[in-house]
């Protein structure tokens, strides 16, 4: 038996920042569960995860070096996305794993949302010289 | 081949200790969460512990809660199981195993005893 996931087919990020919503056909009260999302085709690139447990408020992680942050709903999680760059524009897939008790329940795999980084191109910021000396 | 191999098992007094490992190879061990299994003598399967593919989260059954501490090294593609305040009731072959996922592999097993 698999989870069903409902996720947007494109989103557009104008501020190099996306809010994706991954609607799941399983309500996640009372279960402990890890939301991701992956980025690519081949979902190579973990971008984000989200742990969830009835007694502990999320915890959100990256270890892919993306800045993200994740709200709770009794059958979504959502997935803020910030500091995106126009080259991570790319198909995004949601996850959704009920990780304890077993046994272990995942989802169908989705159609995945096409983010597109539009915005401005974020660049390291210029170093200033020092002052100059007389 | 997909191979996991336990060691650590063996003969111990209650209140002792032991650490279980579980060498992983011929798959990518760190995209795969992974778990800890035991069978009593005579008895089912029984879940100890489980930990996610990045090592941060981890989920322990009522009975080993507070006594076993589950973990994993990425960079050696190994899983470990620390066990503390052992009881006889413990005794039992501990298999680890990958957990969820799109296969379903196991280990051949370390027995534990726990007795006087």
């Known amino acids: 038996n698999k989870i069903l996931v409902k996720q947007s087919p494109m989103l557009v990020a104008y501020d190099n920042a996306v809010n994706l919503s991954c609607k799941y056909s399983y309500n996640l009260f009372s279960r402990e569960f890890r939301a991701s999302l992956h980025k690519g085709l081949d979902s190579a690139v973990e971008v984000c995860v989200v742990y969830g447990n009835y007694s502990q408020q999320l915890q959100v992680y990256s270890k892919t070096g993306f800045n993200c942050d994740g709200k709770l709903g009794n059958e979504s999680v959502t997935f803020y996305l910030q500091n995106l760059y126009v080259n991570q524009t790319d198909i995004y897939f949601c996850k959704i794993e009920v990780m304890y008790p077993p046994p272990y329940l995942d989802n169908e795999k989705s159609n995945g949302t096409i983010i597109h980084v539009k915005g401005k191109h974020l660049c390291p910021s210029p170093l200033f010289p020092g002052p100059s000396k007389p | 081949e997909v191979q996991l191999l336990e060691s650590g098992g063996g003969l111990v007094q209650p209140g002792g200790s032991l650490r279980l490992s579980c060498a992983a190879s011929?798959?990518?061990?760190?995209?795969?969460?992974m778990a800890w299994v035991r069978q009593a003598p005579g008895k089912g399967l029984e879940w100890v512990s489980v930990?996610?593919?990045?090592?941060?989260?981890?989920y322990y059954a009522d009975s080993v809660k507070g006594r076993f501490t589950i973990s994993r090294d990425n960079s050696k593609n190994t899983l470990y199981l620390q066990m503390n305040s052992l009881r006889a009731e413990d005794t039992a072959v501990y298999y680890c195993?990958?957990?969820?996922?799109?296969?379903?592999?196991w280990g051949q097993g370390t027995l534990v005893t726990v007795s006087s």
């Open positions: 930990i996610d593919s990045l090592g941060l989260q981890t």
């Open positions: 011929g798959f990518t061990f760190s995209r795969y969460h």
């Open positions: 195993a990958e957990y969820g996922g799109a296969f379903d592999y």
